[in-house]
């Protein structure tokens, strides 16, 4: 068949130059970012509006709760993305009304509806993981099959526990190693 | 309408600190969105952003100069201040302060303030 | 950072002239963007904001387009008020100034 280059493993989705994976089980907050460094990539951090309303747009279509890489957990009050950046003043328009609240401490930040959430990072909730696309140069072997750019996710509910993330990483393994034909 | 005024000294030598103030009206640092910078410019060259203060009273700092600089502000007043260590002659710039709305573009900015460093 | 790289540095023109800056990002930006007028002396200006939208009193003649990475500002017929620098501003990724550009009378 045609050898294509698809700059993302399998599930992934492609958007703006990064790949990004959406769970479909769930876990807590420090388990979503072990879960996104066992696959080479980071709890999404958004560095720009046209990602954040993609994003937003993915976890309101699957009606999720969605774990992303920021919290006030270093200090109280002080947001900080997982990359050790600061939440800007242009973002915190992004938080839902009366958001973050921190009841209870409510430390970790979600995709709550059409904006964000501050909740208690011991919750299991889904997540995102991103990491930079693949070149799909020759000399590194990313030509490969036709694949959809942006598969339909399964059900929500449908992942059993670390199924999607082990699936993922041997996807992604077998991407970066095999050409399909 | 909204005002900002800067203040300082006009002269400053090698290795002192330079502390400036904004003060401002027509608007309140603790209503949501609600900003105020300082940016420099250097005689005959670019705008160049030093610091931010959000109405949370989160600050910004300039990833090139932060070691050097302090921002806070003072609400109750309607003032804010930027101290910046170890001056330099490199350093010798009109600076501003600006509103910045809800931390993106800056819509008003005060008149400047000369500092000159110099032995 | 993100880096912000304006072109022409110097635009020579006349008046009734259509002029257009370029600015560009280092990295995608989305509108998030804006336009200064400055003159010797005085404090900027604000033209246009998140990329198209202008400014409360400014004049009509002045217009701003694009998105993501690349930027432009013009001016529809240059009016003998508009020499001056002009600078573009990001506010994605905390805030970056390009170099300006200075509009001389040709």
């Known amino acids: 068949t045609e050898r294509l280059c698809h700059p993302c493993p399998w599930e992934w989705t492609f958007f703006q130059g990064n790949c990004y994976f959406m769970s479909n089980s769930q876990r807590n907050w420090h388990d979503s970012i072990t879960a996104c460094k066992e696959v080479g990539a980071q709890l999404v951090v958004i560095k720009s509006a046209e990602e954040q309303n993609f994003l937003q747009l993915q976890s309101s279509r699957s009606n999720r709760f969605t774990w992303m890489g920021l919290s006030d957990l270093n200090q109280e009050g002080t947001w900080q993305w997982v990359d050790g950046s600061p939440l800007l003043p242009s973002f915190k328009q992004y938080w839902n009304r009366g958001e973050p609240n921190n009841v209870g401490e409510e430390d970790c930040a979600e995709f709550s509806g059409n904006g964000w959430n501050d909740d208690k990072c011991n919750l299991a909730k889904f997540w995102i993981c991103k990491k930079s696309a693949a070149s799909c140069s020759r000399d590194e072997e990313q030509f490969l099959s036709p694949a959809p750019a942006t598969p339909n996710p399964p059900p929500a509910g449908s992942g059993g526990g670390l199924n999607d993330i082990f699936e993922a990483q041997k996807i992604e393994w077998h991407e970066h190693h095999h050409h399909h034909h | 309408q909204v005002t900002l005024r800067e203040s300082g000294p006009a002269l400053v030598k090698p290795t002192q600190t330079l502390t400036l103030t904004c003060t401002f009206s027509?608007?309140?640092?603790?209503?949501?969105?609600?900003?105020v910078s300082w940016i420099r410019q250097p005689p005959g060259k670019a705008l160049e952003w030093l610091a931010l203060i959000d109405w949370d009273d989160d600050k910004y700092y300039s990833t090139s100069l932060k070691t050097r600089l302090t921002i806070s502000k003072d609400t109750s007043k309607n003032q804010l201040v930027l101290t910046m260590t170890n001056m330099d002659p490199v350093d010798t710039a009109t600076y501003y302060c600006?509103?910045?709305?809800?931390?993106?573009?800056?819509?008003?900015w005060g008149q400047g303030t000369l500092v000159t460093v110099s032995s | 950072d993100i880096q912000m790289t304006q072109s022409p540095s110097t635009l020579s023109a006349s008046v009734g002239d259509r002029v257009t800056i370029t600015c560009r990002a280092s990295?995608?930006?989305?509108?998030?963007l804006a336009w200064y007028q400055q003159k010797p002396g005085k404090a900027p200006k604000l033209l246009i904001y998140k990329a198209s939208s202008l400014e409360s009193g400014v004049p009509s003649r002045f217009s701003g387009s694009g998105s993501g990475t690349e930027f432009t500002l013009t001016i529809s017929s240059l009016q003998p008020d508009d020499f001056a620098t002009y600078y573009c501003q990001q506010f994605n990724s905390y805030w970056t100034f390009g170099q300006g550009t200075k509009v001389e009378i040709k």
């Open positions: 990295q995608r930006i989305s509108n998030w």
């Open positions: 600006a509103r910045a709305h809800s931390g993106s573009y800056f819509d008003f």
């Open positions: 027509g608007f309140s640092l603790s209503t949501g969105g609600m900003c």
